[in-house]
Amino acid sequence: AILGRSETQECLFFNANWEKDRTNQTGVEPCYGDKDKRRHCFATWKNISGSIEIVKQGCWLDDINCYDRTDCVEKKDSPEVYFCCCEGNMCNEKFSYFPEMEVTQPTSNPVTPKP
């Protein structure tokens, strides 16, 4: 059963390592894949002494852990590299960090990337 699913056809693209990888630095990435597979957007970033450094943004292959996520939110507590994925066109344009502990209330740190 799938309820109210949003298709992902394109995602915001960013690659901090664009020169080495020989890609564009930023843009819009069309998401390709098998017809029977879902597609997602992702963002990955680091927090260096309070400063957000985006590592990559783009399309993400069919992954059940990304299903039904309309917003790109990292919930893991203090990860080394932050990661989130979501469904819906350009849903990785904004990403945020809501560390969810089992007992404490989450705190919100929304981020609007400015590569």
Epitope: I2, N65, C66, Y67, K75, K76, E100
Partner: antibody, heavy 118, light 111 residues
Framework: EVQLLESGGGLVQPGGSLRLSCAAS????????MSWVRQAPGKGLEWVSA????????YYTDSVKGRFTVSRDNSRNTLYLQMNSLRAEDTAVYYC???????????WGQGTLVTVSS | QTVVTQEPSFSVSPGGTVTLTCGFN?????????PSWYQQTPGQAPRTLIY???TRSSGVPDRFSGSILGNKAALTITGAQADDESDYYC??????????FGGGTKLTVLG
């Protein structure tokens, strides 16, 4: 420490019903997709069902479609498997497993035995 | 119906190297199927070894490695030890929520 504790297994007659539960702790349950995997005596592992983080998407192996229902209660950190119209071939140890990015099973419970026999 | 195939059994000498493979009936295995590998000893829950083709799970010794060999996923164990004697399962993620297990390989460490 991540813990997954299954319960609800037991002996049931063919055609009967059982509800399995999996109590999760040590991680943010509402942020993880979950799965049920089973293993018949002396046989290999078989994926049974999966459910997305919100419970909005559910998936089943063909042999249990229409008979089994997976659900989750994120406020109780608990995963469920409602099994109806049970058959002898459903006899197995049922494991619940946490699913992480790249759609793999990163943590497993110890399993609960379901025996379908008259 | 997708069928994932593994060698039913395999033997290796202590200290030797063994490569177990995982294929399927409807084409080539690629990284987009997120191949993962699990070890199971009798009476125990499975243990995660490798995910996303070649990433070792935490605490897994570097004797275990994953790859794509030709059109199959592969698990290689180098310097095999007696306690590597177990059943090994691969899983392919077919997309749209569906996972498929291979039939498993029973690995015997000789001696």
């Amino acid at each position: 420490e991540v813990q997954l504790l299954e319960s609800g297994g037991g002996l049931v007659q063919p055609g009967g019903s059982l509800r399995l539960s999996c109590a999760a702790s040590g991680f943010t349950f509402r942020n993880s997709a979950m799965s049920w995997v089973r293993q018949a005596p002396g046989k290999g592992l078989e994926w049974v069902s999966a459910i997305s983080v919100t419970g909005g998407s559910t998936y089943y192996t063909d042999s249990v479609k229409g008979r089994f229902t997976v659900s989750r209660d994120n406020s109780r950190n608990t995963l469920y498997l409602q099994m109806n119209s049970l058959r002898a071939e459903d006899t197995a140890v049922y494991y619940c497993a946490k699913v992480y990015y790249y759609s793999f099973f990163d943590y497993w419970g110890q399993g609960t035995l379901v025996t379908v026999s008259s | 119906q997708t069928v994932v195939t593994q060698e039913p059994s395999f033997s290796v000498s202590p200290g030797g190297t063994v490569t177990l493979t995982c294929g399927f009936n409807s084409g080539s295995v690629s990284t987009s199927y997120y191949p993962s590998w699990y070890q199971q000893t009798p009476g125990q829950a499975p243990r995660t070894l490798i995910y996303n083709t070649n990433t070792r799970s935490s605490g897994v010794p570097d004797r275990f490695s994953g790859s794509i060999l030709g059109n199959k996923a592969a698990l290689t164990i180098t310097g095999a030890q007696a306690d590597d004697e177990s059943d090994y399962y691969c899983v392919l993620y077919m997309g749209s929520g569906i996972h498929v297990f291979g039939g498993g390989t029973k690995l015997t460490v000789l001696g």
